[in-house]
């Protein structure tokens, strides 16, 4: 009999509110034995797969997906799914990535320009958190976000 697969979790390092031009890493977690983790945008047709799976604990595996230089277009909901043969799991909760426009970011005029990439496999951490405090202490001029329907 096939086992029931637990839902994966999703988080982001360093968090869910990211300065424009800085990096973020999505962390997907599931049980041991996962072959492939997938990071999906709101539309299931936009995704990244990785088989670069590491052991997070004796009972958990994880994969990391890094965006090297966040832009307004990266704002919005993300979720994880995994393949543990012979089947795919349910999706995780959505994590909403917000992008803040600030002065003093890594690509400000007084610093060297940086490299830029779309979700490329590489890591980081934070999770779907509807109760997280709202950006206290942030000196943000704008927050970019993306409205979606569950």
């Amino acid at each position: 009999q096939e086992e029931d697969l637990p839902r994966p979790s999703i988080s982001a390092e360093p968090g869910t509110v990211i300065p424009l031009g800085s990096h973020v890493t999505f962390v997907c977690r599931g049980p041991v034995g996962v072959q492939t983790f997938r990071l999906e945008r709101e539309s299931r047709s936009t995704y990244n797969d990785t088989e670069d799976v590491s052991q997070a604990s004796p009972s958990e595996s994880e994969a990391r997906f890094r965006i090297d230089s966040v832009s307004e277009g990266n704002a919005g909901p993300y979720r994880c799914i995994y393949y543990k043969p012979p089947k795919w799991s349910e999706q995780s909760d959505y994590l909403e990535l917000l992008v803040k426009e600030t002065s003093g970011g890594p690509d400000s005029p007084d610093t060297e320009p940086g490299s830029s990439a779309g979700p490329t496999q590489r890591p980081s951490d934070n999770s779907h958190n509807e109760h997280a405090p709202a950006s206290q202490g942030l000196k943000a001029e704008h927050l970019y976000h993306h409205h979606h329907h569950h």
């Epitope: 988080s11 390092e13 951490d125 934070n126």
Partner: antibody, heavy 118, light 109 residues
Framework: QSLQESRGRLVTPGTPLTLTCTAS????????MGWVRQAPGKGLEWIGY??????TWYANWAKGRFTISKTSSTTVNLRMTSPTTEDTATYFC??????????????WGPGTLVTVSS | ELVMTQTPASVSEPVGGTVTINCQAS??????LAWYQQKPGQPPKLLIY???TLESGVPSRFSGSGSRTQFTLTISDLECADAATYYC???????????FGGGTEVEIK
Amino acid sequence: QSLQESRGRLVTPGTPLTLTCTASGFSLSSYHMGWVRQAPGKGLEWIGYIHTNRNTWYANWAKGRFTISKTSSTTVNLRMTSPTTEDTATYFCARGSYGDYNFLFDVWGPGTLVTVSS
Amino acid sequence: ELVMTQTPASVSEPVGGTVTINCQASEDISIYLAWYQQKPGQPPKLLIYDASTLESGVPSRFSGSGSRTQFTLTISDLECADAATYYCQQYSTTDTNNLFGGGTEVEIK
């Protein structure tokens, strides 16, 4: 808004020990919580943190040696599975989530001294 | 894994002087760097985050700069109350042995 660690104690090597951090003025369900330690006369050493989704992350050296858990909306625990004399230190709990960053710590407990000695 | 290297280990300057503390990350951490002040018998206190953003209530004598791998904390117009140990902390990734640099002890002459 404040944090308070349980009172430190003297334990013998190999004896498991659990420290408790109690929050006042805010709910731990809304914040990620970390643990940091400081050996006498030494620098700050990150142990790990627990996310609001109850996932945990640990420093590479701390994996398997410590377990962090949330036990209620006001308490988070640090369990030392098998302490050695090198674990003698002041242990701090700290609140993350500042500016929505998971492990940027803005509120700290005063710390509690744990002495591991035979 | 990411390593934070802080220099110097200690520094001594007179009242009214300026202290500069450096922190180097072994890989790009963008602006995900904080500075803390710790006095004996007390927990650390957050001074600066996002490399250069001053925490509320922190005097403007404290300033931070840098990005990617090189960061600096500058304390100007030194006061006796600034005698403490200062730590940098990256909050870019948990793939590390320690989020913190080794610390810099500041003595005021």
